[in-house]
């Protein structure tokens, strides 16, 4: 079976406040009403789930309250923001999209976005 195509940027640099945003776009083969988006982090050949949200088309994405992710959706495009990132969180962040309803179920996995996080230099003590 052909996989659903998912596109995401190759590289994103997190802000000095540890926030990274990127767009995950999927080529929907059908008229999905319910979509699940999962962000996976791949580092040292290990894959872990960062966050996930199921949303109804036309509605907002709702991540769990303690999630480090937020997002908005527009058509077949999801704008994802990951917060609280530190240098040790640098890695490949993969967008996985599933069309949950109605059938047929489709799964698409992006190639990943390499997010670089640089911890800010501590401010030197000012002599005033």
């Amino acid at each position: 079976c052909k996989a659903m195509h998912v596109a995401q940027p190759a590289v994103v640099l997190a802000s000095s406040r540890g926030i990274a945003s990127f767009v995950c776009e999927y080529a929907s083969p059908g008229k999905a009403t319910e979509v699940r988006v999962t962000v996976l982090r791949q580092a040292d050949s290990q894959v872990t789930e960062v966050c996930a949200a199921t949303y109804m088309m036309g509605n907002e994405l709702t991540f769990l309250d303690d999630s480090i992710c937020t997002g908005t959706s527009s058509g077949n495009q999801v704008n994802l923001t990951i917060q609280g990132l530190r240098a040790m969180d640098t890695g490949l962040y993969i967008c996985k999209v599933e069309l949950m309803y109605p059938p047929p179920y489709y799964l698409g996995i992006g190639n990943g976005t390499q997010i670089y996080v640089i911890d800010p230099e501590p401010c030197p003590d000012s002599d005033f």
Epitope: E34, M56, M100, P104, Y106
Partner: antibody, heavy 124, light 107 residues
């Protein structure tokens, strides 16, 4: 073991109501799309209604739209079919079925687990 | 909705015979065609998905082929336990629809 067990069938008069239940076990019910498929005596299979894992999306065959309501309680691992304004032509064995959403397959389009069915007879 | 037409509606064959059932879709459905077996008084059981893939645990005497609008289901050597009605189901366009079934009996 993955299992679906239907209940709630029986004899009902035309215009009456009935609520079918389907108890699920052995799999993650809340992430599975669930469906009702019926089979009239001596006839073929007809998809009736379906619901997404979250319960947020539903769909119905034209023949039951406006009369039947599908719902689920993920805390109880149970699927329901509320049938109102029943007609003689609704007489059938009603099966609940899991629609496979396999996370190592990129597209799926089949029912992989079925219950044993419950008979609904609409007659005066 | 896509219409599925199965033939024959019933057949009788001897143990060991090769049995073939065909299923035709009213429009092209790629390879999104599944086959189920239903024994008397029992629920349907998935045998083949996506036209030719054997479900886990299903004997290799069952096979399927085809794409587009024309599909074939074959039992290479009929066994007494294969007495059942067989249904095709299209999985290309929602809602899924089934063929009317083919009843297989032993001579």
């Amino acid at each position: 073991e993955v299992q679906l067990v239907e209940s709630g069938g029986g004899l009902v008069q035309p215009g009456g109501s009935l609520r079918l239940s389907c108890a699920a076990s052995g799999f993650t019910f809340s992430s599975s799309s669930m469906h009702w498929v019926r089979q009239a005596p001596g006839k073929g299979l007809e998809w009736v209604s379906g619901i997404s894992g979250s319960g947020g999306s539903t769909s119905y065959a034209d023949s039951v739209k406006g009369r039947f309501t599908i719902s689920r309680d993920n805390s109880k691992n149970t699927l329901y079919l509320q049938m109102n304004s029943l007609r003689a032509e609704d007489t059938a064995v009603y099966y609940c079925a899991r629609y496979l959403m396999s996370f190592n397959l990129t597209r799926t389009s089949w029912f992989d687990v079925w219950g044993q069915g419950t008979l609904v007879t609409v007659s005066s | 909705d896509i219409q599925m037409t199965q033939s024959p509606s019933s057949l009788s064959a001897s143990v060991g015979d090769r049995v073939t059932i065909t299923c035709q879709a009213s429009q092209a459905i790629s390879n999104y065609l599944n086959w189920y077996q239903q024994k008397p008084g029992k629920a349907p059981k998935l045998l083949i998905y996506d036209a030719s893939n054997l479900e886990t645990g299903v004997p290799s005497r069952f096979s399927g082929s085809g794409s587009g609008t024309d599909f074939t289901f074959t039992i290479s050597s009929l066994q007494p336990e294969d007495i059942a009605t067989y249904y095709c189901q299209q999985g290309d366009a929602w809602p899924w629809t089934f063929g009317q079934g083919t009843k297989v009996e032993i001579k």
